[in-house]
Every structure is written in structure tokens, then in C-alpha cells.
């Protein structure tokens, strides 16, 4: 790795392209510039993504994969480096685009929302789960009354269109639902959404959208949940949710309401048992949540309450606080 | 219970074709994504195809990309792969097998006894 | 070269224990991915033995379990019998390649007679 003390010319790379490999998906591909001199030092190169959205970073191999949206078009440029002596060479850039697919702006779908939900799956045998997808979406405000929209997802290397749809009173696609997908509830990859349309009348602009999946995931309810009284003890249990993720990975919070007096005490916690010391006098009503913890998951959304579950008596006494 | 019988193996020449068929039974078919895995004489074993219940997804190893294509009939309940442009590195035992995603990393939890694949002049 | 590498061989006589161990990178099981194993008898096609990292199908015996840490996944095997003779591999799901489903290269075990 020797290199001569007379000044270094980098040159940029050559045969840089960009080739969609998949929904959201791109493949940037470049070669070393066959003029190079200096061949036997470790030459990189730094990405520079400037649209839809700006990033860079480096690498030492000619090509990278790249998940992003297309809907807006694509560009990106390349260039090689050297680190030298505390310094950092470059050349200048190569540059490629993708053009933004054609369509009015106002002939594609708005308000693109998608969440994820595990249900119970009669047919495996081993994992008892299935992960469902539920998307649904406004038609463009300048989309012709005779637009028809389509949607797919991509996650991982599966991609599937939607076979199961909801139509407005014109007919149109406004909503998907997929009982089963390929998306992997524990997994980290992007989910990605494209929703494309067509029309006799004008070209229909295609969206798409990513959806980290710990944003997206509707949890579902604790189960079995119990509570019983014993003197001034409210006893309160539950089982984790219908969920791929273990026990461990749950956190909960516990809603006991004083039918009485209107007191709401809402407790988090990480175990399946609270106990409260209560006034035995009164009526409650229990109702439990639950959430993938921080510990298996980034922060995600919390499930809809339990139903309410009723223990004590509703006698007039004297109030005493909790 | 599960089974998964292969059948259409044989010897081929370097750029011919042959058809792999699975005949499934003991389960409902039409609800499981299903896949080919193969492996060479003295290897390890290498995924090839995979296909979703419906049969309008398909995946593939980059070493068969453009050359394989698997398909399927659910009325028949029967799983195929299309060999083209075959090639000595394509000679393996071939496996039928379930391909079972759920909520995570596909997992292959039944398996045909295999049918061998034989790419030789 | 399989992207997830296992040792080619492991010996062990009857009653011990044996670990195979299944190293990967950050593309694959250092991403928290899923690892299974697979029983491979001789002349026989091979069956699932543990999913889910740790997770056993039913009829395959406690004497097998699995475990995962950072970019490694690892098969124990205790109280060793002649009939564990058999190839195992490992297998996960690579974010970096298309397909995505990688073995490992297997490791045959031999019960010492």
C-alpha cells in the first residue's frame, strides 16, 4: 500500500446506475474508474443520496442497496476517497437519477395509513400466530371518477398485491386487508406500501410510503383477565396478548376506576399481577393494556383497553380515601 | 398427517430442462406458502425457490434466478419447478418442503424424501 | 462459503454433551433473527428439530436444546445417543442477500463407539 509522494489524482467512478430491484427499492451500482493510477491503495467511496430525502455515508464495495420511496423520483451521487495522512482525498461526483413516475400530484391516494395485528393461525402447527395487514386510504382530490387503485407490500423479499379490498360508493379500491402476510412482527426491516392506479382518462400518479413496523403494530388486549377482592385487597391478574413476542416483553398498565367516588388510579407495571389496597366498600371496574417493552422492541403503541371487568359492592357508606 | 412426495428427477444434459412435481397431502394445501431446497452430493443443503398459498408470489436464490421458475396448482395440490438452462452445479437431491413464515423467519417444517437431479454429458 | 458458518465436525461419546455452535454477522442472527435446526439422519431428508431459536416440535426429545447470543446461535445436545448421528445445520434469514433464507455448511456428529 505504497504511496508515491507526488500529488494523488482520484478520478470519479464510472458506469454509475441506478436500477430498481424491488417496492422501494433501489440498487446502486458503479465501477472503479478504469484510469486510475494508483490501483494497489484502499480506495472508498462515499454515497450521497440527495432525493427524496438527503443522506450519505461510505463503503468500500461497488454497490448499495437503498430502501426508499419512489414516488418523488430518486438521485444520488458517488465519488472515491482516500484517507490520507489525517486528510481525505476525493474526486469529483458521478451522479444518475430516476424520474419521478408520471401523474398529476392530485391523482394519487392521500392519508395512506397501514397497521399490523397477530391473530390466531389454525394452520401452524408450531407458531400459533399469523400477522394481518389493514391499509386504507382517501382517493386524490384531482382523480378521475373512473380511478381504480391497487396496492402491494413489500416485506423483505416478498412482495404480494391486495386481494381482499373495501370500495367507496363509486366503486373505488379505499381500503386492503390481508389476513395473512409474509412481515415478521419481531423483525426489523421496513415494511413498504405502494399503492398505484389507472384510469381511462389520466396517467395516476403512484405513492408510496415506509412503515417502520413498531409504529404500525396494533397490539392486541391482555388476556383472561381476573380480579377479586379479599378484605381491602384487589387482586387483579392477566395473561400476556395473543402476540409472537415472549412474556417477558410486555409492559402493562392497569386502569381501576371507584364507581363510587370517580377515583381513577392507572398503575404500569411488567408483571401479569397487581394487587391494590382498596376501599371494599365500593364497586370497580378493572381494565388492563399492554405494550411491547423497550427492552424487545423500540417504543410502539399501546393496545386498546381490556374489557371492563366488575368486582365489589355498590353500598352507600361513609367514603374513606384510598 | 403431512406428506410431500417428489417426483421428475433424472439425468439431463448442461442446458437442458426437467420438471419437478410435489404431490402434497394430509393438510390444506392451498393455505401454506411452500418452497424447493436442494442439496449437492456430499453438501450442505441450499434454498431455491420459495412461493406464496396463492401462487402469485414467488422468490429465488440468486444462483437459479432467471433460469427456475416455481409454480403451483392448488386444485391439484401439487408444487412445481421448472428447470432450465441446467448446469453441473444444479446436480442435487431436490426437496419439497413448507414454508412457514407466520410472524418471523420461514421455517421448513415438513420435507419430502427428495428426487434427484443429475446435470451430466 | 455459507454465510452462516458451523463447524465441519464434532465427536462426543455416549451420555456427554456436545455443542455445535452457528456464527453469523449483524445482517443476520446480530439482527435478532429467528435461528432453526435440522436433524439430517443418514440417507434420510432432514427434519426440523429446534425453531425459534430454543423451541422444540413436538416428539423431538428435551435432550436437545437451542440458544442465540449476539451473532451466534448455538445446538446443545445432552446425554448423548447413538441414534444423534447425524448432520445439523443451522439456518436464519439474511437482510443483505435476495431470498433471504441461509444455511449453515452443517457439522456432522459422530458418536464414539
Known amino acids: 500500500d505504497l504511496l508515491p509522494d507526488d500529488k494523488i489524482s482520484l478520478l470519479p467512478p464510472v458506469n454509475f446506475t441506478i436500477k430498481v430491484t424491488g417496492l422501494a427499492q433501489v440498487l446502486l451500482r458503479w465501477e472503479p474508474n478504469p484510469d486510475q493510477e494508483q490501483r494497489n491503495v484502499n480506495l472508498e467511496y462515499q454515497v450521497k443520496i440527495n432525493a427524496p430525502k438527503e443522506d450519505d455515508y461510505e463503503t468500500r464495495i461497488t454497490e448499495s442497496k437503498c430502501v426508499t420511496i419512489l414516488h418523488k423520483g430518486f438521485s444520488a451521487s458517488v465519488r472515491t476517497i482516500l484517507q490520507k495522512d489525517h486528510s481525505l482525498l476525493a474526486s469529483s461526483w458521478a451522479s444518475a437519477e430516476l424520474h419521478a413516475p408520471p401523474g398529476s400530484p392530485g391523482t394519487s391516494v392521500v392519508n395512506l395509513t397501514c397497521t399490523t395485528n397477530t391473530t390466531a393461525d389454525n394452520y401452524s402447527y408450531l407458531r400459533p400466530y399469523q400477522v394481518s395487514l389493514h391499509c386504507t386510504w382517501l382517493v386524490g382530490t384531482d382523480a378521475p371518477e373512473d380511478t381504480q387503485y391497487f396496492l402491494y407490500y413489500r416485506y423483505g423479499s416478498w412482495t404480494e398485491e391486495c386481494q381482499e379490498y373495501s370500495k367507496d360508493s363509486m366503486g373505488r379500491n379505499i381500503a386492503c386487508w390481508f389476513p395473512r402476510t409474509f412481515i415478521h412482527s419481531r423483525g426489523r426491516d421496513w415494511l413498504a406500501v405502494l399503492v398505484n392506479g389507472s384510469s381511462k382518462h389520466s396517467a395516476i400518479k403512484p405513492f408510496d410510503q415506509l412503515f417502520a413496523l413498531h409504529a404500525i403494530d396494533q397490539i392486541n388486549p391482555p388476556l383472561n383477565v381476573t380480579a377479586e377482592i379479599k378484605g381491602t385487597r384487589l387482586s387483579i391478574q392477566w395473561e400476556k396478548p395473543v402476540s409472537a413476542f415472549p412474556i417477558h416483553c410486555f409492559d402493562y398498565e392497569v386502569k381501576i376506576h371507584n364507581a363510587r367516588n370517580g377515583y381513577l388510579q392507572i398503575e404500569k407495571m411488567m408483571t401479569n399481577a397487581f394487587i391494590s389496597i382498596i376501599d371494599d366498600l365500593s364497586k370497580y371496574d378493572v381494565q388492563v393494556r399492554a405494550a411491547v417493552s423497550s427492552m424487545c422492541r423500540e417504543a410502539g403503541l399501546w393496545s386498546e383497553w381490556s374489557q371492563p371487568i366488575y368486582v365489589g359492592k355498590d353500598e352507600h357508606k361513609p367514603l374513606r380515601q384510598w | 398427517q403431512v406428506q410431500l412426495q417428489e417426483s421428475g428427477g433424472g439425468l439431463v444434459q448442461p442446458g437442458g430442462s426437467l420438471r419437478l412435481s410435489c404431490a402434497a397431502s394430509g393438510f390444506t394445501f392451498s393455505n401454506y406458502a411452500m418452497s424447493w431446497v436442494r442439496q449437492a452430493p456430499g453438501k450442505g443443503l441450499e434454498w431455491v425457490s420459495a412461493i406464496n398459498s396463492g401462487g402469485k408470489s414467488t422468490n429465488y436464490a440468486d444462483s437459479v434466478k432467471g433460469r427456475f421458475t416455481i409454480s403451483r396448482d392448488n386444485a391439484k395440490n401439487t408444487l412445481y419447478l421448472q428447470m432450465n438452462s441446467l448446469r453441473a452445479e444444479d446436480t442435487a437431491v431436490y426437496y419439497c418442503?413448507?414454508?412457514?413464515?407466520?410472524?418471523?423467519?420461514?421455517?421448513?417444517?415438513?420435507w419430502g424424501q427428495g428426487t434427484m437431479v443429475t446435470v451430466s454429458s | 462459503q455459507s454465510v452462516l458458518t458451523q463447524p465441519p465436525s464434532v465427536s462426543a461419546a455416549p451420555g456427554q454433551r456436545v455443542t455445535i455452535s452457528c456464527s453469523g454477522s449483524r445482517s443476520n442472527i446480530g439482527s435478532g433473527y429467528d435461528v432453526h435446526w435440522y436433524q439430517q439422519l443418514p440417507g434420510t431428508a432432514p427434519k426440523l428439530l429446534i425453531y425459534?431459536?430454543?423451541n422444540r416440535p413436538s416428539g423431538v426429545p428435551d435432550r436437545f436444546s437451542g440458544s442465540k447470543s449476539g451473532t451466534s446461535a448455538s445446538l446443545a445436545i445432552t446425554g448423548l445417543q447413538a441414534e444423534d448421528e447425524a448432520d445439523y445445520y443451522c439456518q436464519s434469514y439474511d437482510s443483505s442477500l435476495s431470498g433471504h433464507v441461509v444455511f449453515g455448511g452443517g457439522t456432522k456428529l459422530t458418536v464414539l463407539r
Open positions: 418442503a413448507d414454508y412457514a413464515t407466520n410472524y418471523g423467519v420461514p421455517y421448513f417444517g415438513s
Open positions: 425459534d431459536d430454543n
